[in-house]
């Protein structure tokens, strides 16, 4: 880590449409980038009448949005589709939602991919 | 400093096939995801086919799904894109552009581009 | 396919002044939106990424917002070299698609 700031080499992998786009569905994914660029990992999920539906997790390329965030948290009230970011390995493991304008309980990963 | 060259193009009549390639350099080829993206004359961009940085996964436009085929060679550091059964809609330069993850792609280098015209 | 509809196609302005483009997904994109410049005969190239991040060596007088659905690209100060055909991209989903592009004119 530089200055104390966890350096992300590996995030989560998930893609829902992973038959369309012909990838694997889960996995670990490396993440590469420039070396004067910051990587980040990043999740988005829907939550459908209180079902959570992971769309994508994976690597996410040096978005200040994410900076010196070690846990991956959605602040946007009520979104069409939830996108949180973080720093550190497999920071994506796990994701929230925290509303900055409400104070409501978090809504959790529950979710284990299932194979196909 | 990182470059990207297209060749290959050139004039082909409808039903021909081209192969163009795409030479990197600058930048660990082999650690990046790779798109081929059109532009008709005086028309907008057209994002034909992408490759994760393994070769693992390929993506394709409807347009050209079952005629173009992307591959890469990351021990030359060539990105190729094999162009079958041609149509006079494929007329367009052909840039080749560097992705970053592939859930995030964003083409943040791109190739001078090559013409390619299908034409009798 | 996610459609991507940008407007206006094409604006005059004067140096100096302040330019708005829009750019509209047919369903949410979270914020996986790019924007790109291009001039005549030459490649495009990258001016936003993840619809707020600036790409590197681009003037600061660049700015993206917006998330979802409704994405807007600013140039605060219109200088001599902006003008120039300007699109938007998606990368939520493969196929990746493009606006049909804004050109910027000298008035």
């Known amino acids: 880590a530089i200055l104390g700031r966890s350096e992300t080499q590996e995030c989560l992998f998930f893609n829902a449409n992973w038959e369309r786009d012909r990838t694997n569905q889960t996995g670990v994914e490396p993440c590469y980038g420039d070396k004067d660029k910051r990587r980040h990992c990043f999740a988005t999920w829907k939550n459908i009448s209180g079902s959570i539906e992971i769309v994508k997790q994976g690597c996410w390329l040096d978005d200040i949005n994410c900076y010196d965030r070690t846990d991956c948290i959605e602040k946007k009230d009520s979104p069409e589709v939830y996108f949180c970011c973080c720093e550190g390995n497999m920071c994506n493991e796990k994701f929230s939602y925290f509303p900055e304008m409400e104070v409501t309980q978090p809504t959790s990963n529950p979710v284990t991919p299932k194979p196909p | 400093e990182v470059q990207l060259l297209e060749s290959g193009g050139g004039l082909v009549q409808p039903g021909g096939s081209l192969r163009l390639s795409c030479a990197a350099s600058g930048f660990t080829f082999s650690s990046y995801s790779m798109n081929w993206v059109r532009q008709a004359p005086g028309k907008g961009l057209e994002w034909v086919a992408g490759?994760?940085?393994?070769?693992?996964?390929?993506g394709y436009a409807d347009s050209v799904k079952g005629r173009f085929t992307i591959s890469r060679d990351n021990s030359k550091n060539t990105l190729y894109l094999q162009m079958n059964s041609l149509r006079a809609e494929d007329t367009a330069v052909y840039y080749c552009?560097?992705?970053?993850?592939?859930?995030?792609?964003?083409?943040?280098?791109w190739g001078q581009g090559t013409l390619v015209t299908v034409s009798s | 396919d996610i459609q991507m509809t940008q407007s206006p196609s094409s604006l005059s302005a004067s140096v100096g002044d302040r330019v708005t483009i829009t750019c509209r997904a047919s369903?949410?994109?979270?914020?996986?939106l790019n924007w790109y410049q291009q001039k005549p005969g030459k490649a495009p190239k990258l001016v936003i990424y993840a619809a707020t991040s600036l790409a590197s060596g681009v003037p600061s007088r660049f700015s993206g917002s917006g998330s979802g659905t409704d994405f807007t690209l600013t140039i605060s100060s219109l200088q001599p070299e902006d003008f120039a055909t300007y699109y938007c991209?998606?990368?939520?989903?493969?196929?990746?698609?493009f606006g049909g592009g804004t050109k910027v004119e000298i008035k």
């Open positions: 552009a560097r992705g970053a993850n592939w859930h995030d792609t964003h083409l943040d280098y």
């Open positions: 991209q998606q990368s939520y989903e493969l196929p990746l698609t």
């Open positions: 369903q949410s994109i979270v914020r996986y």
């Open positions: 490759i994760n940085y393994n070769g693992g996964y390929k």
